[in-house]
Interface confidence: low
Amino acid sequence: IPVIEPSVPELVVKPGATVTLRCVGNGSVEWDGPPSPHWTLYSDGSSSILSTNNATFQNTGTYRCTEPGDPLGGSAAIHLYVKDPARPWNVLAQEVVVFEDQDALLPCLLTDPVLEAGVSLVRVRGRPLMRHTNYSFSPWHGFTIHRAKFIQSQDYQCSALMGGRKVMSISIRLKVQKVIPGPPALTLVPAELVRIRGEAAQIVCSASSVDVNFDVFLQHNNTKLAIPQQSDFHNNRYQKVLTLNLDQVDFQHAGNYSCVASNVQGKHSTSMFFRVVESAYLNLSSEQNLIQEVTVGEGLNLKVMVEAYPGLQGFNWTYLGPFSDHQPEPKLANATTKDTYRHTFTLSLPRLKPSEAGRYSFLARNPGGWRALTFELTLRYPPEVSVIWTFINGSGTLLCAASGYPQPNVTWLQCSGHTDRCDEAQVLQVWDDPYPEVLSQEPFHKVTVQSLLTVETLEHNQTYECRAHNSVGSGSWAFIPISAGAHTHPPDEFLFTP
């Protein structure tokens, strides 16, 4: 590391004095300091001498000596004060440019360290600093305005108290430039537009930036439109707005509209599509199947997508039967808007009851007329089973009725002993009835089937069980012949309550 003689951090001299600063290093050394007159420089290899015979206030500053060949890049410094009673300040630059939120150094160097206690920073013509101006002072470097703001772009003077009066420096102009983060921000309204031929339309393209230097234009398909520009400044941003007003739209106005803005940082663009139609339209659709099957007690959301222009004048969900005359609760109907012309309407049917099976219709109306979309909702039920003993054409017959949806399959089991339910070990015989007789099969209702098992003689120490199953579940009924007649057992667990 080079060494400076005199080996003091600060040196205070009077105007006109001779000052000699000597720097010695291992290799060649170089001086660096404020640009000022009257210095002469002598070098002889490993030492360098900076000297003046007539020091002035302009020689005030920090002089640094470096050794270019030093890999550690070490340096030494000495600060020189030339204390001129008439000149308390040495201003190194009269214009300082920084970006917003950077620290701005106003380089007015104090020529006499004794004056430090009475220094202040003011705006020209003695005006006070703006509120919230946060600054600090260093006698070696000057005033620093911390995190400078655009609004602090002003002319400043450094003030020192000398003999009871304030002595000002020459002025320093601070320019705080806005940081332009990127191309201007854009909005194009609306994001999508539909109009009937002959209607009026408006498209607004606006761009904003922290800096006033940017351009904006609106183009239709690939043609730049000549539209007067409105300019504004608010929220610390410059705004430029282009408004396209069309009194009576026609098909040639349809197409792609792009809003484009550019500045030194680059270009932004956003687009929208304008559709011109001959007349009002209203389209209903659903991603769901219009025929729905749901297990009783479960929930279902019916969802309808609506595309319409002009907007809907009315809409509702209606239950068309065939059961009760109840109507869907309004609180279960939910409407969401995907965008201006597309909406989704949802009917929530939680914990479906038997009386809620049937047809649900969504109706909507706009100036284009009425449209309806109807869902058919069938409920699935696990089978319910009952068995009776009867005589048909003189033959003893077990008659099993099973009711559920989808249509239940029927299986008969004969097993040893008296039991509520045949288990595998007890089973003597199994008969599948592939074609049970359908007794009733109305839309939205359970399907009831009947299966007959002709039994010549009932074995009294045996159980006859009818089992029915479908995709939802199963049910069974055990028939136990006893000497005093017949005895039937629905299994205890089969108490079906939807």
Partner: antibody, heavy 120, light 112 residues
Framework: EVQLVESGGGLVKPGGSLRLSCAAS????????MNWVRQAPGKGLEWVSS????????YYADSVKGRFTISRDNAKNSLFLQMNSLRAEDTAVYYC?????????????WGQGTLVTVSS | DIVMTQSPLSLPVTPGEPASISCRSS???????????LDWYLQKPGQSPQLLIY???NRASGVPDRFSGSGSGTDFTLRISRVEAEDVGVYYC?????????FGQGTKLEIK
């Protein structure tokens, strides 16, 4: 039945990474926004991140911004949370929750949660 | 960020008695569409949270009608008309008006 099942939690060292997954079933996954919420041991609920149905809009809590990435695969009915540069304070049970259809955002249902422990 | 403040933080209740929990937001949760973007959740011991009330007053599917929500703007209340043993847990309010979505600190309901 609507179901959400989280996976991918575990023990990881500070600075490490983990990828959480949430498998959805029983509903049209591509129609709903999805969310991650976490709960540090013995503490309350903290929203972590949300992603819209088509992944066009993504939001993060400040505490995870720049470290966590939410994503989804609508074809596979899956939601993900890639967690990088993990810290001890990220230790929590992470829940995935279905959001509403736009513009409603209530969280229903929630998964059972997966525990993430960040410790050296 | 919108700050959600719940009170009380602990709520001992006798079964069959009513209970109410207050939730206050640092700014209005009323959207221009007329809805308050305030939801209530219950986290039972050892379980995941479950939705109770959405958009300030709408009961979620399967939630008993003894639960009700009310309020508008910045002040909201969850009421339980008759507390049952199965209602124990931590109740949270949450705003979804704007991100970051924020929860209240939670109110622990206990049976006396």
């Amino acid at each position: 039945e609507v179901q959400l099942v989280e996976s991918g939690g575990g023990l990881v060292k500070p600075g490490g990474s983990l990828r959480l997954s949430c498998a959805a079933s029983g509903f049209t996954f591509s129609s709903y926004s999805m969310n991650w919420v976490r709960q540090a041991p013995g503490k309350g609920l903290e929203w972590v991140s949300s992603i819209s149905s088509s992944s066009s809009y993504i939001y993060y809590a400040d505490s995870v911004k720049g470290r966590f990435t939410i994503s989804r695969d609508n074809a596979k009915n899956s939601l993900f949370l890639q967690m990088n540069s993990l810290r001890a304070e990220d230790t929590a049970v992470y829940y995935c929750a279905r959001g509403g259809s736009f513009p409603y955002n209530w969280f229903d249902p929630w998964g059972q949660g997966t525990l993430v422990t960040v410790s050296s | 960020d919108i700050v959600m403040t719940q009170s009380p933080l602990s709520l001992p209740v006798t079964p069959g008695e009513p209970a109410s929990i207050s939730c206050r937001s640092s700014q209005s949760l009323l959207h221009s569409n007329g809805y308050n973007y305030l939801d209530w959740y219950l986290q039972k011991p050892g379980q995941s949270p479950q939705l109770l009330i959405y958009l300030d007053s709408n009961r979620a599917s399967g939630v008993p009608d003894r639960f009700s929500g009310s309020g508008s703007g910045t002040d909201f209340t969850l009421r339980i008309s008759r507390v049952e043993a199965e209602d124990v847990g931590v109740y949270y309010c949450m705003q979804t008006l704007q991100t970051p979505y924020t929860f209240g600190q939670g109110t622990k309901l206990e049976i006396k």
